[in-house]
Each structure stands twice: as structure tokens, then as C-alpha cells.
Interface confidence: low
Amino acid sequence: MKTLPAMLGTGKLFWVFFLIPYLDIWNIHGKESCDVQLYIKRQSEHSILAGDPFELECPVKYCANRPHVTWCKLNGTTCVKLEDRQTSWKEEKNISFFILHFEPVLPNDNGSYRCSANFQSNLIESHSTTLYVTDVKSASERPSKDEMASRPWLLYRLLPLGGLPLLITTCFCLFCCLRRHQGKQNELSDTAGREINLVDAHLKSEQTEASTRQNSQVLLSETGIYDNDPDLCFRMQEGSEVYSNPCLEENKPGIVYASLNHSVIGPNSRLARNVKEAPTEYASICVRS
């Protein structure tokens, strides 16, 4: 009967293993859940420069098997999967990071992103995180806060294209004007071309409504006011779907550019469609001796 103690030992061992799940011995972190968790903060944002490399991190907590994680970019109410983008995992002591690589950051990377994890047939979605991309090339010519809501950004985009003919026309008109001026000293030209006048305008803060995010340079996202980016002064009023622009101060002079009467709002337009343009003004050039 020497087998009896051995059998008893095996029996005890069996009960220990049987009770382990109930005793929570496996759980190293105490009472922490073994569910997959995505630790992207609500209202998180990153202000980054175009041209720089950047790693967008999705902190993932899991226990045994690493879940399948993907990144997507918010486009209105849908989140478009970023399957062709370079991603990687970075393992830290108590948390892992699923990283979306930007090599480098492009201006159109501006927008809200979300990571999601597939775990045991469950889909877990993170909060969205917002990238605010500053285009370094246009940084020197970026408008002030006061101009932000009123400048027709389309004009900005069209200037490189339309600027040359405009310049030639202006020069031609000036040339004609000067010739007339030389020929008739006392005669003044009434209309010397349609030069855009930069006027002092008193801009008023206007409330705008939006229920979907715009993937434009001005991103209406679920985040709070971004005090540190001069270009981003829209905030979502808490508990509502109304966006307002608190950054415009009344009676502050700003530059208003004349409209080119283009009604096309393309994907490159930096102005959210619902932001009203300021009235435009024109002026004639009068050359005096």
C-alpha cells in the first residue's frame, strides 16, 4: 500500500490546480482584468511638423495572446482602415505599443485616428487621437488666429497656379499705366488692373455648426480647445454638437483677401465648409507722381 501516499499527493495536487482559477493565483496584477485594453486618452492630440518622422502609439494591455490591432483614420462618421501603412509592435515592461509609422509626416496626415483590437471575436475600439500637422513650408505665411476663420484657404492653394498670370497682368497694367503717365503727366488712370487690396477688416467670431469631422487643415474633432496651435482654435462645446471659434477677438484688424469667385471646395481646401468667408473687397491702383 505504498502507493496510497503518492495517490493522496496527486489528489492534493489535482485540487490545487482545480482551485487555482478561483483563488486568482495566476493574476500577477492583483484584481486586474485580463481583457484587452487600449489606453489612448480621451482628447489626446499631437502637434507635429510635416516632414518629420513620427510614431503614433496605441498602448495595448493584454495578458496571454497578443490581439490583432489595426489603425484607422476617421473620415466623417466612418473610420478608414490604414492597411497599407507601416506598423510595428514595441514591448515595454507592463504595456505594449502598436505603432503607426509616419515616414515622414505629410500635411494630409492631419486628422483623427483610432486603433482597434480584435480579441476573442470582440472588437475593442480606442478613443480617437488627433494629429495636427503644421506644414513647415507655409509656416511663415500662416495667418493669425484672427484671420483663421475668414481667410479663403482655397485662394492659398490656388496662388501658386493663378499667381503667375495675375502677376503678369498686374505688371502689364502697371506698364501701360506708367506709359500713359509719361505721355500725359496730368492724366491719371482710373482703372489700372484689378489688384487685390489688403484691407483692415474687423472680424467677428461666428458660430458654426458641424456634426461630422472635416478632414481638412481645420479639423473639427472631439478634442478640446488647442491653446498651443495658432491654427487650431476650434473647440467642441461640451455636451453639444456645436462648434465655436473662441479665438477671434472682436475689433481686431485682420487681412482679408479678395475672392476669386471659385466655388469649388476640393479635398485640399483647408477651410471647413461651414465656416463663412468674410466679405471681400477690391481696390484700384492710382499712380500719382
Epitope: Y39, K41, H46, S47, G224, D227, E238
Partner: antibody, heavy 119, light 108 residues
Framework: QVQLQESGPGLVKPSETLSLTCTVH????????WSWIRQPPGKGLEWIGY???????KYNPSLKSRVSISVDTSKNQFSLKLTSVTAADTAVYYC?????????????WGQGTTVTVSS | EIVLTQSPGTLSLSPGERATLSCRAS???????LAWYQQKPGQAPRLLIY???SRATGIPDRFSGSGSGTDFTLTISRLEPEDFAVYYC?????????FGQGTKVEIK
């Protein structure tokens, strides 16, 4: 164990710029938010602003026009600059690490450095 | 800006007694974004509670946090001599962090 050490001049003249540096010892500056908080003598805590290791910043609106926070990941340091100081800026300045995932608690603090604004 | 109002300003109690500290927000705060800190004279604040009710590493279980929305509470079940200090609540609102003005727990 992560420790934070504030350094900088203890006395600053009015209208000058206050500059402080926080060095992170025993851990990486990566993956965390790094905040500056101050406490005027006998008063409560006031959050100044934070910087994420990537360089993203957010500031207290009441100080925004005067404050800037920068990070140097190679030196494991982040810095605070406060311009045009007055006597009201006299305080103990703390740097703190903020756990960046899900919760917003400041789990590690420096011991604080006293800055007096006086001529 | 979310304003946090702590009450009472000062709490005079004896060791072994129960302390109940209140923190009221001017508008709703997510429970995930409320923390409590303890500060002793000449020292930096120390994290006690995060996410309104989770104890930080190394914090004794006599400290507990509760509440949601605009009303949050820090409870010290049995005051120890080392618990006499100033306690601050802190939140992360829509745009930045704010602290309450503090509650001083002093020996009666």
C-alpha cells in the same frame, strides 16, 4: 525607481525670464506626459502645463502667453520658461510625471524648487 | 474651466477617527479623470487615488475614493498620525488640469 529633480535659479528679478529644468532619473522620458505645477507660499497647487515626449504641449490658459515647455529626450530632461515674471510668480515649482494611458494621474513628483521673484 | 471646490477647508479630527473629504466639480467630470493627492509640509504632493476610486501603489487600504459626475469623496477610515496633511483633488477637463483648493486635516 523613477525620480525627478528640478534645477534652476532660486532668485529671479521682476520682468526677467524664469528658467527651470527637470531631469528624469531611473527611467525613460518616452511614453509619458511631463507637467509643471507651482504652489505659491501658503496656497494651493496650480497646473502650468505639460509636454509629451514627442514635443506636443498644452498650457494653462491663464499663463499661456508667458509660458513655454520644451523637452530634450537625449538628456532625459524637460524645461520650463516663464517670461515677464512678477512677485506673483514666487512659488515652489514642481515637475511631475503623468501616466499617459487612460487615467491622468501624476504618479511621480520632484521634490520642488523654490523660486523667489524679487529685485 | 472646471472649478473644483473642496470642503471643508479644515477638518479637525483625532487619530482613529474617520475622515470624509468632499470635492465638488462645477461641471461633470469623468470618473477616470479624477485623482486625490496628499501633501505634507515641505514635501511634494503624493498620489493617493486615481480614476476616482483606484488606490495608487503603496497606498494603505484605509484610503478610499468614491463618487461620479460632480461629487467625489475621499475617505480615510481610521486616521493614523501620519495622515494629518493637506489633501487635494485634481481633474482633467476639456482643456486642462485643475486642482481643488485643498482640505487640511489637522489633529484635534
Amino acid at each position: 525607481q523613477v525620480q525627478l529633480q528640478e534645477s534652476g535659479p532660486g532668485l529671479v528679478k521682476p520682468s526677467e525670464t524664469l528658467s527651470l529644468t527637470c531631469t528624469v532619473h531611473g527611467g525613460s522620458i518616452n511614453h509619458y506626459y511631463w507637467s509643471w505645477i507651482r504652489q505659491p507660499p501658503g496656497k494651493g497647487l496650480e497646473w502650468i502645463g505639460y509636454i509629451y515626449y514627442s514635443g506636443s504641449t498644452k498650457y494653462n490658459p491663464s499663463l499661456k502667453s508667458r509660458v513655454s515647455i520644451s523637452v530634450d529626450t537625449s538628456k532625459n530632461q524637460f524645461s520650463l520658461k516663464l517670461t515677464s515674471v512678477t512677485a506673483a510668480d514666487t512659488a515652489v515649482y514642481y515637475c511631475a510625471r503623468e501616466w499617459p494611458y487612460y487615467y491622468y494621474e501624476m504618479d511621480v513628483w520632484g521634490q520642488g524648487t523654490t523660486v523667489t521673484v524679487s529685485s | 474651466e472646471i472649478v473644483l471646490t473642496q470642503s471643508p477647508g479644515t477638518l479637525s479630527l483625532s487619530p482613529g477617527e474617520r475622515a470624509t473629504l468632499s470635492c465638488r466639480a462645477s461641471q461633470s467630470v469623468s470618473s477616470s479623470y479624477l485623482a486625490w493627492y496628499q501633501q505634507k509640509p515641505g514635501q511634494a504632493p503624493r498620489l493617493l487615488i486615481y480614476g476616482a476610486s483606484s488606490r495608487a501603489t503603496g497606498i494603505p487600504d484605509r484610503f478610499s475614493g468614491s463618487g461620479s459626475g460632480t461629487d467625489f469623496t475621499l475617505t480615510i477610515s481610521r486616521l493614523e498620525p501620519e495622515d494629518f496633511a493637506v489633501y487635494y483633488c485634481q481633474q482633467y477637463g476639456s482643456s486642462f488640469r485643475t486642482f481643488g483648493q485643498g482640505t487640511k486635516v489637522e489633529i484635534k
